[in-house]
C-alpha cells in the first residue's frame, strides 16, 4: 500500500467520539500522552484531532493500471508533532511524537461504515482496526465476513472546520 503523494489531499479538524457517543480525549501525563474513552461532562470541550487525508494505491492494483486501487488513508494528530500510531505487537493505539515522513504505523485506511460513521484500519496490519476496549483505544481484529458492523470499531467524526495549519 503506497501513499501516492507526500502531501495530504485535504485536512480537517474534528472531534472523535465512539458510536455510543463517548468522547476520545487526550491527556499529558508524565511527559507522554494518554488516550481515554469517556463520557464528557456537559461543560467540557471536546478534544480536537487534525485528520490529514492521503490517497493510497491498493496493493492489488500496484502492478496494474491503478483503476481499482484508490483508498483514503488518514493520520490523526491531536496536538502538534504527535500522531496516533498502531502498535501491532501490543495490539494498542498510542500517541507518539514523530517527524515527517511519518512511519507507516501512523496511517489508517478510512472506511465509511455508514454515512455518519467511520472505521480506521491499520495500514501495517490489514484487518485490524482501531477500536474501544476497556475504556481505551486498542487494535481489534475484525473478521470481515462476520463482524463488519462491530460497534466497538465505529467512530463518529464531528468536523469543526477546514484546517490549514496546526
Amino acid at each position: 500500500m503506497s501513499i501516492t503523494g507526500i502531501s495530504p489531499i485535504t485536512e480537517s479538524l474534528a472531534s472523535l467520539s465512539t458510536y455510543n457517543d463517548q468522547s476520545i480525549t487526550f491527556a499529558l501525563e508524565d511527559e507522554s500522552y494518554e488516550i481515554y474513552v469517556e463520557d464528557l461532562k456537559k461543560d467540557k470541550k471536546k478534544d480536537k484531532v487534525l485528520l490529514s487525508y492521503y490517497e493510497s494505491q491498493h496493493p492489488s492494483s500496484e502492478s496494474g493500471d491503478g483503476v481499482d486501487g484508490k483508498m483514503l488513508m488518514v493520520t490523526l494528530s491531536p496536538t502538534k508533532d504527535f500522531w496516533l500510531q498502531a502498535n501491532n505487537k501490543e495490539h494498542s493505539v498510542e500517541l507518539h511524537k514523530s517527524e515527517k515522513p511519518l512511519p507507516d504505523q501512523a496511517f489508517f485506511v478510512l472506511h465509511n461504515r455508514s454515512f455518519n460513521s467511520v472505521s480506521f484500519e491499520s495500514k501495517t496490519d490489514p484487518g485490524v482496526f482501531i477500536g474501544v476496549k476497556d475504556n481505551h483505544l486498542a487494535l481489534i481484529k475484525v473478521d470481515y465476513s462476520e463482524n463488519l458492523g462491530s460497534e466497538n470499531i465505529l467512530f463518529k467524526l464531528s468536523e469543526i472546520h477546514h484546517h490549514h495549519h496546526h
Epitope: G69, K70, M71, V109, N112, R113, G149
Partner: antibody
Amino acid sequence: EVQLVESGGGLVQPGGSLRLSCAASGFTFSSYWMYWVRQAPGKGLEWVASITPNGGNTYYPDSVKGRFTISRDNAKNSLYLQMNSLRAEDTAVYYCARGHYYYTSYSLGYWGQGTLVTVSS
Amino acid sequence: DIQMTQSPSSLSASVGDRVTITCKASQNINKHLDWYQQKPGKAPKLLIYFTNNLQTGVPSRFSGSGSGTDFTLTISSLQPEDFATYYCFQYNNGWTFGGGTKVEIK
C-alpha cells in the same frame, strides 16, 4: 477497465413496478459504495439511493423513500434498484455509479451510461 | 437536508474566456464537494473532488476552491470541448447535487 452497464429500463404505467440492474466489472465490486442517480428529461442530476459495500446500510432521499429499494449481490457483481408505485415524475435516465475510493462514501468516480425509465399511461 | 445552490444556471462564453461557476451550500460541508461535467447524451464525469483535487486526466485549466459553504469551479481558458453542463455535489451529510450550470458558446 471499470465498466458499469445498466439494464431493465422501459415503459411502465403509473403505479407499476420496475427492477433496474447494473452489471459491474473491472474492479473489486464488494469493496465499494454504490449509487443510483437519475436525470429527468432536460433536468439536473438527482441522487436516488446509496448502499454500503456489504449491503448492510442503504440511504434514500425523501422523494423515493418507501418506494425504491437499492440492493446488491456481491457474488454476482451486481447492483439493483427495485422501483414500486412509480409516478410520472420518476421518468428519467437512471445511472449506476461507483464510489471513487475503496470503502468510502466520498465522490462518484465512475458512471454507467444510464437506462431510460418512462412512466406513462 | 443540505441544499446546493449553483449559479449561474447558464452562461455564454467564448473560447479562451475565463469562466467561474459558484456553488453555495445551505450549511457547512467542510471540503466535501465535487464538480462533475456532463455533455449531452453522456454520463456525468468526475472533474474535481474534495473541493480542489483534479481527477486523473482532467486538464489543469480546471480548478476548484472554497470551504464551508462557498465553492467555485474555474476554467482558466475555455476550450471547445468544455462546452457542457457542470454540477456541484456534496457528500458531507447525505448526498446532494446542485442544479447545474450550462456553459454555452457565445
